[in-house]
Interface confidence: low
């Protein structure tokens, strides 16, 4: 209309798809009787009736919109359900009354593309290749508007390079309006990126602000010749029997050559091909003292049909033989004595120490171990160590179970533990004995045993924190045949005032969870970026 | 070697505009991210703005969204700090520097002084 | 925006003293196992520089009486033997969010 002043810039809504678009109708009482409103849609210039409202009441107009509008706000918002991106378009109201005005909305959609998924050239890249290969595909599938590729090498990104990197970018637009886009890179590439980790990177906006996602990281198979073959021992050092023991071949080409590994036998001195994996990796698991020997390794190329065969390797497998103690198992009366004797062989000089399983001190120094007027607290684990002081980690150990006759033991007489009323306690009830007891409980819950050692048995029960509980609390009955004993844990209710129990009372063993906290672990490497500048 | 070398700075009135430039040299500009420090006469540093040269993806300091504008000009090795409604407290030392993706700044220019006064 | 409160804001030293720093955010800036802490030197009239990252790293041409440490909210910086050349101004900044945001320096003076 000549005159008229220029409009003014549409107010900006944001929303994802599927969601529900509010369009208010920003007319002031000065513009408009929001009573009296009609609402338009623009799409490329064309301006299609969409709502009327009369004297507050809304009516949709036939069409794509129909089904999906309803008035709020007593009349001043649109409502616009399951937004598509279909519906990015200027939204208009238009007071009639006093006189005509509009208000414009731009209605902005966006959606989140499904997490990239990165799809390696499988062929491989040979490195004397004259210009860029396929690396790898990156297809990012219903996003809106286009999301942004960025691709990565070892984590720094890639950017188009004459003759070295090309970037190929796609988009196609789905029925639904989504584009999904698809990204090709291609590259040229050295030795060196044999081993180079490369990922595509999605980003995009949504209403809260910039986001992206990473594909997983991939390596591209690249090939080069072979020059040099050679074996390697895994691991390091000093191999002790009992190790896992990896003797492989490896090449500086790829693809590699085919690869037999090679042990010289002791008595004929002939070299005995092994038996290796299907990777070619001749696996020691556990190592024994047999497998020491002369090892070399040959590489054929079967293209060329030449032979390369690397340096001999010795390797000596340390071992200490099985630990023996004697008596295996005893069990003896309160007051008896006991000799304890460890026994074994190694190709080294052995040293031998007693420890107490549970404390871990050191009892003795030497093969035996000499225990006198036992008392029914000596009962438990004694381990004999065997070792070889110059090769740390080579050893054996034996552990043996002295048991003492008696009743059962409990970890603890009474004690006191507190709860707050409808939490579910988490109870717990040691009790050592020979023979090993059982543990009952005088009150319903879910129980379970767990065995700590063959005298030793730990029972731990799941129950509801109630009234009768508080007043009767809860006993836990250790039992064998030659006896019984109760612990009794004492429950008292703690209020949000009070502060930890004093040093002289304990919750000892017994844990209690007032509501469970479930946290699902997220493995999405979506992130949340900062709000970029507004879209313009 | 690496560097950078901030320009542009003066004096200027308020309300009025200023543009810096930061100029950079032995190393590939669009692998690293560019970010504009200020620091004020006997003040602290407080981080403006970042770019990614190889992208022209921007991040903002959320107290200069609107008045302040990053950008660059690969060809140039350069990147710009558009600076619009200017005021007083904008007086200060304006600083470029690189980083990589963990955001520690490894170079930094010399600094261009930016004094807003009528 | 992660807070970063320096201490102490200054400080007097000798040459030869052991100096420590300390940087604390208002909320943690350690993500799986990296710690996002800087520290940076700064001399009047020049421009910062990085002396250590991401928490412990000692940046390349510093020297190795500079190290750092800490992790979630509580950091330091730590000069073992002070030299004549390190009476400057410290910063540390944090690059867990956006904005990155430095402490309020603390100004390491001679005795």
């Known amino acids: 209309v000549p005159g008229e002043a220029e409009q003014p810039a549409p107010e900006l809504v944001e929303v994802e798809v599927g969601s529900t678009a509010l369009l208010k109708c920003g007319l002031s009482q000065s513009q408009g009787n929001l009573s009296h409103v009609d609402w338009f849609s623009v799409h490329k210039e064309k301006r299609t009736l969409i709502f009327r409202v009369r004297q507050g009441q809304g009516q949709s107009e036939p069409g794509e919109y129909e089904q999906r509008l309803s008035l709020q706000d007593r009349g001043a918002t649109l409502a616009l359900t399951q937004v598509t991106p279909q519906d990015e378009r200027i939204f208009l109201c238009q007071g009639k009354r006093p006189r005509s005005q509009e208000y414009r909305i731009q209605l902005r959609v966006y959606k989140a593309p499904e997490e990239p998924n990165i799809q390696v050239n499988p062929l491989g890249i040979p490195v004397n290749s004259k210009e860029p290969e396929e690396v790898a595909t990156c297809v990012g599938r219903n996003g809106y508007p286009i999301p942004q590729v960025i691709w990565y090498k070892n984590g720094r990104p890639l950017k188009e390079e004459k003759n070295r990197v090309h970037i190929q970018s796609s988009q196609t637009v789905e029925s639904s309006g989504l584009y999904t886009l698809q990204s090709i890179l291609k590259a040229q590439l050295v030795k060196e990126d044999k081993d180079a980790q490369f990922y595509c990177e999605l980003n995009y906006r949504l209403p809260s602000g910039n986001h992206m996602k990473e594909s997983r990281e991939v390596t591209v198979p690249v090939f080069y010749p072979t020059e040099k073959v050679w074996l390697e021992v895994e691991p390091v050092g000093m191999l002790k029997e009992g190790d896992r023991v990896e003797i492989r071949c490896l090449a500086d080409g790829n693809p590699p050559p085919h690869f037999s590994i090679s042990k010289q036998n002791p008595s004929t001195r002939e070299a005995e091909e092994e038996t290796t994996n299907d990777n070619g990796v001749l696996v020691l698991e556990p190592a024994r003292k047999e497998h020491s020997g002369r090892y070399e390794c040959q590489g054929l190329d079967l293209d060329t049909m030449i032979s390369l065969l690397s340096e001999p390797q010795e390797l000596l497998v340390n071992y200490v033989s099985d630990v023996r103690v004697s008596p295996a198992a005893p069990e003896r009366q309160e007051g008896s004595s006991l000799t304890l004797t460890c026994e074994a062989e190694s190709s080294q000089d052995l040293e031998f120490q007693w420890l107490r399983e549970e404390t871990g001190q050191v009892l003795e120094r030497g093969p035996v171990l000499q225990l006198h007027d036992l008392k029914r607290e000596a009962g438990g684990g004694y381990r004999c160590v065997a070792s070889v002081p110059s090769i740390p980690g080579l050893n054996r150990t034996q552990l043996v179970n002295v048991a003492i006759f008696g009743p059962p033991w409990m970890a603890f007489k009474e004690r006191k533990v507190w709860v707050k009323e409808n939490m579910v306690l988490n109870l717990s009830c040691e009790a050592s004995g020979h023979p090993r007891p059982t543990i009952s409980w005088n009150v319903n819950g879910t129980a379970s045993e767990q065995d700590q050692d063959p005298q030793r048995v730990l029972s731990t029960l799941n129950v509801l924190v109630t009234p009768e509980l508080l007043e009767t609390g809860v006993e836990c009955t250790a039992s064998n045949d030659l006896g019984k004993n109760t612990s009794i844990l004492f429950l008292e209710l703690v209020n949000l005032t009070t502060l930890t129990p004093d040093s002289n009372t304990t919750t000892g063993l017994s844990t209690s969870t007032a509501s469970p906290h479930t946290r699902a672990n997220s493995t999405s490497t979506e992130r949340k970026l900062p709000e970029p500048e507004s879209r313009g | 070697q690496v560097q950078l070398v901030e320009s542009g700075g003066g004096v200027v009135q308020p309300g009025r505009s200023l543009r810096l430039s930061c100029a950079a040299s032995?190393?590939?500009?669009?692998?690293?991210?560019i970010h504009w420090v200020r620091q004020a006469p006997g003040k602290g540093l407080e981080w403006v703005a970042r770019i990614y040269p190889g992208t022209d993806i921007t991040y903002y300091n959320e107290k200069f969204k609107g008045r302040f504008t990053i950008s660059r000009d690969n060809s140039k090795n350069t990147l710009y700090l558009q600076m619009n409604s200017l005021r007083a407290e904008d007086t200060a030392v304006y600083y470029c520097?690189?980083?990589?993706?963990?955001?520690?700044?490894?170079?930094w220019g010399a600094g261009t002084m930016v004094t807003v006064s009528s | 925006e992660i807070q970063m409160t320096q201490s102490p804001s200054s400080l007097s030293a000798s040459v030869g003293d052991r100096v420590t720093i300390t940087c604390r955010a208002s909320?943690?800036?350690?993500?799986?196992?990296?710690?996002?802490m800087h520290w940076y030197q700064q001399k009047p009239g020049k421009a910062p520089k990085l002396l250590i990252y991401l928490a412990s790293n000692l940046e390349s041409g510093v020297p190795s009486r500079f190290s750092g440490s800490g992790s979630g909210t509580d950091f330091t910086l730590t000069i073992s033997s002070l030299q004549p050349e390190d009476f400057a101004t410290y910063y540390c900044q944090h690059s867990r969010e956006l904005p990155y945001t430095f402490g309020q320096g603390t100004k390491l003076e001679i005795k």
């Open positions: 032995g190393f590939t500009f669009s692998n690293y991210w």
């Open positions: 909320k943690s800036v350690s993500i799986s196992g990296y710690s996002y």
């Open positions: 520097a690189r980083s990589g993706g963990y955001w520690y700044f490894d170079v």
